[in-house]
């Protein structure tokens, strides 16, 4: 039961995390105009990965997409790539984890296959979360560097009187959404990996002994069945298979690779 809960919770946490990564990637507020210690303007600037926006105090907002690929900073391209990779891996991980969920029965899928899928999705979630955290952190670092450079320009008066007001940018809401979402995806992935350990049938518990009788052969396995069958006394295996939606007939009609005849 604990394994099912861990797997289910890992899936839900990862789902929320990936939704957050998608939201952060689409958000326009990756960087917002720094209002502290600046002249009060009637115009507010903010920028995303895909477009930059200007909100006037009149309420009019204008957004312009970055309609160039080659003209964009390499760092911005790298952040975009990291976020997209994170989303793609997360989406694939979600797809895999749906089939791996213990509460969902798909055909004759073995528990070892579910364990492998759970581990795969867990790893994908971990990498997805790391990609998002890395992407957001790279962007944040870029902002910090530019912030202090523009502050230095402001106070040292480099290059004399410039024709544009030095607009400084600080952390936008999308960065915090990205960090939290990346963290949640990472946590979800770790939970899936932990659940996988509980799902995977241990070799020592499945070393069945074959007794050859005349005319037919029967395999006796210690544990591995639901408690109601009365077979075996291995509490660990009972715990794992408790709550499973299988009947005794199902177990018998779909032998696994651990059944030795």
């Amino acid at each position: 039961m604990a394994v099912t809960a861990c797997q289910g919770l890992g899936f839900v946490v990862s789902l929320i995390g990936i939704a957050g990564i998608i939201a952060a990637t689409c958000m326009d507020q990756w960087s917002t105009q720094d209002l502290y210690n600046n002249p009060v303007t009637a115009v507010f600037n903010y920028q995303g990965l895909w477009r930059s926006c200007v909100r006037e105090s009149s309420g009019f907002t204008e957004c312009r997409g970055y309609f160039t690929l080659l003209g964009l900073p390499a760092m911005l391209q790298a952040v975009r790539a990291l976020m997209i990779v994170g989303i793609v891996l997360g989406a694939i991980g979600l797809l895999v984890s749906i089939f791996a969920l213990k509460c969902i029965r798909i055909g004759s899928m073995e528990d070892s296959a579910k364990a492998n899928m759970t581990l795969t999705s867990g790893i994908m979630f971990i990498v997805s979360g790391l990609c998002a955290i890395a992407g957001v952190s790279v962007f944040a670092n870029m902002l910090v560097t530019n912030f202090w450079m523009s502050t230095a320009n402001m106070y040292t008066g480099m290059g004399g009187m410039v024709q544009t007001v030095q607009t400084r940018y600080t952390f936008g809401a999308a960065l915090f959404v990205g960090w939290v979402a990346g963290g949640l995806t990472l946590i979800g992935g770790v939970m899936m990996c932990i659940a996988c350990r509980g799902l995977a049938p241990e070799e020592t518990n499945y070393k069945a002994v074959s007794y050859h009788a005349s005319g037919h052969s029967v395999a006796y396995k210690p544990g591995g069945f639901k408690a109601s069958t009365g077979f075996g006394s291995n509490t660990k295996n009972k715990k794992i298979y408790d709550g499973g939606a299988r009947t005794e007939d199902e177990v018998q009609s779909y032998p696994s690779k651990h059944d030795y005849v």
């Epitope: 105009q33 002249p39 009060v40 303007t41 009637a42 115009v43 600037n45 920028q47 930059s52 926006c53 200007v54 006037e56 105090s57 009149s58 309420g59 009019f60 204008e62 312009r64 410039v162 024709q163 544009t164 007001v165 607009t167």
Partner: antibody, heavy 118, light 113 residues
């Protein structure tokens, strides 16, 4: 069409207060900021402040801070400008205006003459 | 506060001739976010409220004749009336729409020579 109708002329004594109203029509009252601009006789234009009728948020010219209060009544779709501690130099025509894109003022009230005299 | 300096104070131009009004800001009104200059031009006739002519330094308001044009960027701006008409006699104001408080220039009176 968009119209901003202001209250009539006022004559006040120094130290008194005046409250000028501005009733816009022809658009959704809460969708645009209302600004107040004054013009002393034979002088130029001076921005006093602005209010967002939807949220009630205000921004003031520091020159008038503490003396001017901008309010908006959504139920009657009317904006108000109250100027206290009146002085003779406050004698001017007070305009309300609608703020649009570019933070510019596209529609103006007809103006309200406030005369401060002892 | 941003100081808006208009020149000349008054201008006499013959009908059909070009009239040019200058406006200088103490700080740049160019917003780096959208590369727009937050400067507006108004026309005010005696006994009337001001009328919006041009916003974003060069965008003509709908209904404004195309003989009115705005140009300039950063700190220096110009309003040009390509062919002065009798109805253009008025006082013209520039306004900073970027920094609070929103300040106006002193005005330029345009008359017919």
């Amino acid at each position: 069409q968009v119209q901003l109708v202001q209250s009539g002329a006022e004559v006040k004594k120094p130290g008194a207060s005046v409250k000028v109203s501005c009733k816009p029509s022809g658009y959704a009252f809460t969708n645009y900021l209302i600004d107040w601009v004054r013009q002393a006789p034979g002088q130029g234009l001076e921005w006093m402040g602005g209010i967002n009728p939807g949220s009630g948020d205000t921004v003031y010219n520091e020159k008038f801070q503490g003396r001017v209060t901008l309010t908006a009544d959504k139920s009657s779709s009317t904006a108000y400008m109250e100027l206290s501690s009146l002085r003779s130099e406050d004698t001017a025509v007070y305009f309300c205006a609608r703020r649009v894109r570019g933070n510019s003022f596209d529609s103006w009230g007809q103006g309200t003459l406030v005369t401060v005299s002892s | 506060d941003i100081v808006m300096t208009q020149s000349p104070d008054s201008l006499a131009v013959s009908l059909g001739e070009r009239a040019t009004i200058n406006c200088k800001s103490s700080q740049s009104l160019l917003n780096s976010g959208n590369q727009k200059n937050y400067l507006t031009w108004y026309q005010q006739k005696p006994g009337q409220p001001p009328k919006l002519l041009i916003y974003w330094a060069s965008t003509r308001e709908s209904g404004v004749p195309d003989r009115f044009s705005g140009s300039g960027s950063g700190k220096d701006f110009t309003l040009t009336i390509s062919s002065l008409q009798a109805e253009d006699v008025a006082v013209y104001y520039c306004q900073n729409n970027y920094f609070y408080p929103l300040t106006f220039g002193g005005g330029t009176k345009v008359e017919i020579k």
